[in-house]
């Protein structure tokens, strides 16, 4: 329903963290906003963190979350940490504006995270 | 309190025209997608058209059952959204509900197409 | 277009009773789901947005669950007065934003 813009493609650092933007445009005056991060792969879709937050504050997710996000208006950038190689994919935004009515959801064409596990180092001599 | 209250339904011939008009207090009506449902005697809800806010141009979307012969509009200044509906068919008989977002839901104009 | 599946299309169940209804889409709708319910004569009403949110003023026996393409309204202990029609609605854009064909629930 919304429009969500998002990177069409992220390359995870060698630390296994990407980070990337998702903005929306609101069609009106949300003061309470929450933004999903999901993943699809084929035809399942899971849930990788979400977290709710209050316009002009911070974006809290979970202690155990592998996400960190901060926002500005209507632009969350949004942080995944913990990425290895078989957790490259493709990343979908979901923004919903929950309060006050009415209520609005939109969803990102999604980014895809490449992560490339680091090679070893190899065994010195020295 | 929220109200959105349709008026111009009425009885009407195959062919001809009709204007619905949804008239909106209660909320903010600048903020909100307006949307026409219709429901046909004794059947389910079928989403009519959707007219978005000025952020989204107005874009406006039709089912493809009315596309080409209904047109949604809106008037922000005075809180009221419209369907004009052309060439209407026996078909198209039903209860029309206006709906803010598809939170608020007006209480329904009858209109009959038949000769 | 994206097609809703509602079933059953109808169920008959006692005071008490938990009820389920399930709503399928066609394809990933990502929880863009509402629910509303219908009473006879009545206008419809909003009971779950976004599949699994409370609308104001519904009672807590209403849950919606789901994601990707199936989505469930469970009533957990069904009462007189939830005796109605209710219809889901994808609400993912673009349109046309499609309703299920219904569940009419009544008391045995």
């Known amino acids: 329903a919304m429009h969500v813009a998002q990177p069409a493609v992220v390359l995870a650092s060698s630390r296994g963290i990407a980070s990337f933007v998702c903005e929306y445009a609101s069609p009106g005056k949300a003061t309470e906003v929450r933004v999903t991060v999901l993943r699809q792969a084929d035809s399942q879709v899971t849930e990788v963190c979400a977290a709710t937050y209050m316009m002009g504050n911070e974006l809290t997710f979970l202690d155990d979350s592998i996400c960190t996000g901060t926002s500005s208006g209507n632009q969350v950038n949004l942080t995944i940490q913990g990425l290895r190689a078989m957790d490259t994919g493709l990343y979908i935004c979901k923004v919903e504006l929950m309060y006050p009515p009415p209520y609005y959801l939109g969803i990102g064409n999604g980014t895809q995270i490449y992560v490339i596990d680091p090679e070893p180092c190899p065994d010195s001599d020295f | 309190e929220v109200q959105l209250v349709e008026s111009g339904g009425g009885l009407v011939q195959p062919g001809r025209s009709l204007r619905l008009s949804c008239t909106a207090s209660?909320?903010?009506?600048?903020?909100?997608?307006m949307n026409w449902v219709r429901q046909a005697p004794g059947k389910g809800l079928e989403w009519v058209a959707q007219?978005?806010?000025?952020?989204?141009?107005?874009?406006?979307y039709y089912s493809d059952s009315v596309k080409g012969r209904f047109t949604i509009s809106r008037d922000d200044s005075k809180s009221i959204a419209y369907l004009q509906m052309n060439s209407l068919k026996t078909e198209d008989t039903a209860v029309y509900y206006c709906?803010?977002?598809?939170?608020?839901w007006g209480q329904g104009t009858t209109v009959t197409v038949s000769s | 277009d994206i097609q809703m599946t509602q079933s059953p299309s109808s169920l008959s169940a006692s005071v008490g009773d938990r009820v389920t209804i399930t709503c399928g889409a066609s394809e990933i709708i990502y929880g863009a789901l509402n629910w509303y319910q219908q009473k006879p004569g009545k206008v419809p009403k909003l009971l779950i947005y976004g599949a699994t949110n409370l609308a104001d003023g519904v009672p807590s026996r209403f849950s919606g669950s789901g994601s990707g393409t199936d989505f469930t309204l469970t009533i957990s202990s069904l009462q007189p007065e939830d005796v109605a029609t209710y219809y889901c609605q994808k609400i993912l854009s673009p349109p046309p934003w499609t309703f299920g064909g219904g569940t009419k629930v009544e008391i045995k």
């Open positions: 007219i978005r806010n000025k952020p989204y141009n107005y874009e406006t």
């Open positions: 209660g909320f903010t009506f600048s903020d909100n997608w």
């Open positions: 709906t803010g977002g598809m939170d608020y």
